[in-house]
């Protein structure tokens, strides 16, 4: 989805670089080709990154953070590609290479700016803490700190705790906000500036509905246009509530297009889900059944939660008999 | 054009100490190796020491391996040779030159020489 | 360390004959080869690089060739201003050594 890195163009044969934790990047430099090519790579102008010269590469006195990590694009050379093929970037390779290049015409020097990121898919979670309810959007690994914002129907909301935990190469964040009793909707958009990514996650609470021992019910899931490419790998799970925790009932893989159903009572409609239509079916309604329903469909960019409260009374029959 | 200029040589004694420079310009100092040469009067040329763009590596001939160190100050745009317990056989005139590239090719340009005499 | 080596030592010549000096190293150096030449009360001042490649503004009738080991220097058609002592100089890796050089004069 992302490519290997992006630069930006800045002034003074200074580049920016900017790349993704753990990923491979691509240093540029170019210069005008000649005879008796010396390419010096060096960071923050003391540590040797990688050097070539006489046709080959020289990496006695690389530094020892840079072993294996380092290549030329060797074919392009004689083509005037300096270029560094970096691999598996970490938040400690930030900063400043200088590339030297030197023919037996001329010799130049290019610096770039290297600047890495980090955003692992952040998550929106549905909580019960007690008689308490919680909307949790949280990022296990961000970098740098990321903005998070937060809007109750559509209206942006200023309360905004945010529980940070440092790793020496990123941020652990958890956002918690305190829904109790509210059947209004939420969203919650977390921004990677650097990488220029975001990430949003929807809530939606339906009215409840109320249904007879052995009746069936059917519960609306239906993406969201503004947030929903159909072209875009996405997971759709549908849980139910059980004294404070969530079993799943069913998952959908759009990248695999399988369905896995683990109660037997739980029907979809494939056509539907060809629609991208992810509402439910749960037949012969029990009164254990009731509770509190959650469709979850995510992806890299979002999370849409939807919530509907079932309630399952007796029948008259059961009553009756009773 | 590129100009190199020695300075520092002069008569000294055996086991004493000397400093040379050399003053370089009409080039980007700093983008490139520089060497040290040397030649007894009437002899063959002699490599001494090279050292990078960067003063990152350096190399001497074994001959004064341990007694001579080269530096630069790319600052000053100038080349240094510091030569430690001179022998007799130190006696000459050094050249400083400049590399093709980055410290690790010929000798592309040639200063005039400083003459160094270790004589008791 | 690679040793190098020059033959002649020095040679006479008349006026257009052609010249050869011979450089030999004592381990293979690729075509790191460079050629050297010093004129009386002079610095020296490179003629040839890369064993073959020929410095701008030095004459054609200057040449190199060899590879590995071998090397040769030819003057096509000596010149008096050819006078000088000729040095070779290895540079694959250091220490760059010169050879004993080669005093060319004219008959």
């Known amino acids: 989805i992302f490519p290997l890195a992006f630069f930006i163009y800045v002034p003074m044969n200074e580049q920016i670089v900017i790349g993704r934790l753990d990923e491979d990047i691509i240093l540029p430099s170019s210069f005008e080709r000649g005879s008796e090519v010396v390419i010096h790579w060096k960071y923050q102008d003391s540590y040797k990154v990688h050097s070539y010269y006489k046709g080959s590469d020289h990496l006695e006195s690389q530094d020892p953070r840079y072993a294996n990590r380092t290549s030329l694009f060797y074919n392009e050379i004689q083509n005037g590609n300096a270029s560094l093929f970096f691999r598996r970037v970490s938040l400690l390779d930030e900063g400043i290479y200088t590339c030297y290049v030197g023919t037996a015409i001329q010799v130049i020097t290019n610096k770039v700016v290297l600047k890495v990121g980090v955003f692992l898919t952040p998550v929106m979670k549905y909580e019960k803490r007690n008689t308490n309810s919680f909307l949790i959007c949280s990022v296990l690994s961000v970098y740098p700190r990321p903005i998070i914002t937060w809007k109750m129907d559509n209206t942006p909301i200023s309360e905004n705790n945010m529980e940070e935990t440092g790793s020496l190469d990123s941020f652990s964040i958890n956002s918690p906000l305190n829904i109790t009793g509210s059947n209004s909707s939420y969203e919650c958009t977390i921004e990677n500036s650097l990488l220029k990514q975001t990430w949003t996650g929807r809530w939606t609470m339906k009215d409840g509905l109320h249904k007879m021992q052995s009746e069936h019910v059917s519960l609306s899931c239906q993406p969201v246009n503004d947030y929903f490419s159909p072209n875009q790998d996405f997971k759709v799970t549908w849980s139910r509530m059980k004294s404070g925790t969530f079993s799943v009932l069913a998952y959908y893989l759009s990248s695999s297009q399988n369905t896995i159903i683990n109660e037997s009572r739980f029907s979809w409609n494939k056509e539907l889900i060809n629609q991208s239509d992810f509402s439910m079916n749960l037949m012969d309604l029990n009164l254990s059944d009731s509770g509190e329903y959650l469709c979850n469909i995510s992806s890299d960019e979002y999370t849409l939660l939807t919530i509907h409260t079932v309630h399952v009374e007796p029948s008259q029959e059961t009553a009756s008999h009773n | 054009q590129v100009q190199l200029v020695e300075s520092g040589g002069g008569v000294v004694q055996p086991g004493r100490s000397l400093r040379l420079s050399c003053a370089a310009s009409g080039f980007t100092f700093s983008n490139y190796g520089m060497h040290w040469v040397r030649q007894v009067p009437g002899k063959g040329l002699e490599w001494v020491a090279v050292?990078?763009?960067?003063?990152?590596?350096?190399d001497y001939a074994d001959s004064v391996k341990g007694r001579f160190t080269i530096s630069r100050d790319n600052s000053k745009n100038t080349l240094y040779l510091q030569m430690n317990s001179l022998r007799v056989e130190d006696t000459a005139v050094y050249y400083c030159a400049k590399d093709l590239i980055s410290g690790i090719y010929y000798v592309d340009h040639w200063g005039q020489g400083t003459l160094v005499t270790v004589s008791s | 360390d690679i040793q190098m080596t020059q033959s002649p030592s020095s040679l006479s010549a008349s006026v257009g004959d052609r010249v050869t000096i011979t450089c030999r190293a004592s381990?293979?150096?690729?075509?790191?080869l460079a050629w050297y030449q010093q004129k009386p009360g002079k610095v020296p001042k490179l003629l040839i690089y890369a064993a073959s490649t020929l410095q701008s503004g030095v004459p054609s009738r200057f040449s190199g060739s060899g590879s590995g080991t071998d090397f040769t220097l030819t003057i096509s058609s000596l010149q008096p201003e050819d006078v000088a002592t000729y040095y070779c100089q290895k540079y694959n890796a250091a220490p760059f050594t010169f050879g004993p050089g080669t005093k060319v004069d004219i008959k």
């Open positions: 381990q293979g150096i690729s075509n790191y």
């Open positions: 050292i990078w763009y960067d003063a990152s590596e350096k």
